[in-house]
């Protein structure tokens, strides 16, 4: 006799509230001769054997309820043309029950803790009644083929809700369940799936890049935010407002939007959001300079690739500080930023900062009523030798007959540090070169006592890492004062 619960050619279990017994087997080689099934009570009526005829070409049969007692154990076997078909099977009617499907309620609770999670309430099947069942649940994205089983399996004496974790925002999911009698066999059918949609996430962090508080009229600002789920393509709706005026930008791709002039607040929300949290609001009002942080300092952090930033509180305590930084020449959307609580007056900026690259670092105090930014500081992880020298040109003589020259600044990305000083060199034809250092604040030089003839002039700039190459030569001819560039 095959023990109950192990699959075999013949399987029997009770089904549904009427408690009929369903038996099925693998199709037989001879389909024309119908088999005959027999069952015998092993508990209550050991001497009674029932015969059940099977319609031809059918590989299952139901044994009517009136032929057996509910909690009995049955011995079941089959014959075809009088010959045994399979080993007999023992069926425990208390445990070999195929339960109905569990009921999954359509109210789905979604929360965003560390990840996006969905919780679903459920009820056990009506049948079998008063039995402790174990139920198993599974979920998948609506378009997916394969299901993910949820662990642990849940028992009907506790009715713990079904929890799905690490869900993607703005995605359709399906969940279904099935049950079996505890220590029994087999599993019930999977319930028809409940479909639900996770909401799109609001951006986690909204900030403004550029000159939102610029007073000179060159106000170019970009609202920027961090994508809560970079893998999911979401568009956003952005609202800007000032007084009674509100402007809306729809279908905005991630993660930037130009700030119209004179706007006082901005709100960003996922495009078709039915979000369960208020959208992210940022005040764009510029507060008085005394509210801004002061004495901002920047230095290369010892033994780390980061950059250290410190500051002092302005006249009042803000809600938080935002430190933002960008590489020289980067577009407004290439901004990085970090938020810090009001008690923090320093931070180590994370990331890999490249030597010789200038970074513009700004510390802003955020208040409920607006923003107050300290003047930006240009800092370096490490200074390098300049890549170029300044261009030199001639100014009007002062006094007449005494040449005056000026030179420009080397672009920040070629300077690769802060200028410590300039070196001004002059070379007369056939004579040695004379150089002298001048302050980094000086960009002109007067050339008294030059004899008649031709001269070449050039300037280098130095950072703490060393002296850069000469800039373009200026050819100078005395006394005719004509200038030719080499």
């Amino acid at each position: 006799t095959r023990p109950h619960g192990s699959p075999g050619p013949l399987q029997c279990y009770s089904v549904g509230p009427l408690g009929i017994l369903n038996c099925s087997w693998e199709p037989l080689g001879d389909l024309e001769t119908p088999p005959v099934l027999y069952h015998q009570s092993q508990k209550y009526h050991p001497n009674r054997v029932w015969e059940v005829k099977v319609p031809s070409k059918q590989s299952w049969v139901t044994i009517p309820r009136e032929q057996f007692t509910m909690a009995d154990k049955l011995l079941i076997w089959g014959t075809q043309k009088g010959r045994p078909l399979w080993s007999s099977v023992s069926v425990n009617l208390e445990t070999q029950m195929k339960p109905d499907t569990p009921q999954i309620f359509s109210q789905v609770d979604i929360s965003e803790e560390a990840t996006l999670e969905a919780t679903v309430q459920w009820a056990p099947p009506v049948w079998p009644p008063q039995k402790v069942l174990i139920c198993q649940f599974r979920y998948k994205e609506c378009q997916a083929e394969t299901w993910t089983r949820l662990e642990p399996q849940l028992k009907t004496d506790g009715l713990t809700p079904v929890e799905m974790q690490n869900l993607e925002p703005g995605t359709c999911y399906q969940v279904s369940g099935r049950c079996q009698v505890e220590n029994g066999y087999p599993w019930g059918e999977w319930s028809s799936p409940l479909s639900f949609q996770t909401p799109f996430l609001d951006p986690e962090d909204v900030w403004v890049s550029g000159t939102v508080c610029e007073t000179s009229g060159k106000r170019a600002a970009l609202l920027v935010w961090k994508d809560p789920r970079p893998c999911v393509q979401v568009t956003y709706t952005v609202w800007f407002g000032a007084g009674d005026i509100t402007t809306t930008q729809e279908e905005v791709p991630c993660c930037k939007s130009p700030v119209p002039a004179w706007m006082e607040w901005a709100v960003v929300s996922p495009g078709n959001s039915t979000s369960w949290v208020p959208p992210t609001n940022l005040s764009l009002v510029c507060l008085a300079p005394e509210s801004a942080p002061c004495d901002v300092g920047v230095s290369s952090a010892d033994g780390s690739p980061g950059i250290k930033v410190t500051w002092k509180q302005g006249t009042r305590k803000p809600l938080e500080y935002v430190v933002d930084w960008a590489q020289d020449g980067d577009s407004l959307d290439k901004l990085n930023w970090t938020r810090l609580p009001p008690g923090n007056l320093s931070t180590l900026l994370p990331g890999e900062f490249k030597g010789g690259v200038p970074y513009r670092i700004t510390v802003t105090a955020v208040y409920s009523g607006g923003l107050a930014a300290a003047p930006s500081v240009w800092g370096f992880r490490e200074e390098l030798v300049p890549l170029a020298g300044p261009a030199v040109w001639r100014l009007p003589d002062d006094p007449p007959g005494t040449p005056v020259v000026a030179w420009g600044e080397v672009p920040r990305h070629q300077l690769r540090g802060q200028a410590t000083h300039y070196t001004f060199c002059i070379q007369s034809r056939g004579l040695s070169t004379v150089c002298r250092n001048v302050s980094s604040q000086t960009q002109t030089a007067t050339l008294p006592n030059l004899h008649l003839g031709s001269f070449k002039l050039w300037v280098t700039v130095s950072t703490v890492a060393g002296q850069g190459p000469p800039g373009p030569n200026l050819s100078l001819h005395l006394p005719d004062n004509r200038i030719r560039w080499k």
Epitope: V298, S299, V464
Partner: nanobody, 123 residues
Framework: QVQLQESGGGSVQTGGSLRLSCAAS??????MAWFRQAPGKEREGVAA????????YYADSVKGRFTISQDNAKHTVDLQMNSLKPEDTAMYYC??????????????????WGQGTQVTVSS
Amino acid sequence: QVQLQESGGGSVQTGGSLRLSCAASGYSINRMAWFRQAPGKEREGVAAISIGGDRTYYADSVKGRFTISQDNAKHTVDLQMNSLKPEDTAMYYCAAGLVYGEAWLDSRHYNKWGQGTQVTVSS
């Protein structure tokens, strides 16, 4: 690697003068500063100078009495201390770093430090 060595400390009467010197070797610093620490007190900034010497900064307590200067040829930064007071008594440290912005006397930004030289002012 930057190495800093202070000299010039000593004992002096109130109203007297001392000149501290800090010799720097190595590269990649753009500011040097003097800090001091009296027994049982926190370290405080005294004066700072940018390499190139075109910017200086002083603590309010020493303005008008102390002067920081740089000798590019000798790679030294000097602190001339005049009109010394007993409250100037402390261990004086030279510090250097690659520092930007307005944190002139914030010790968190200076990552190279000398061993210190003692200054004692008696009344």
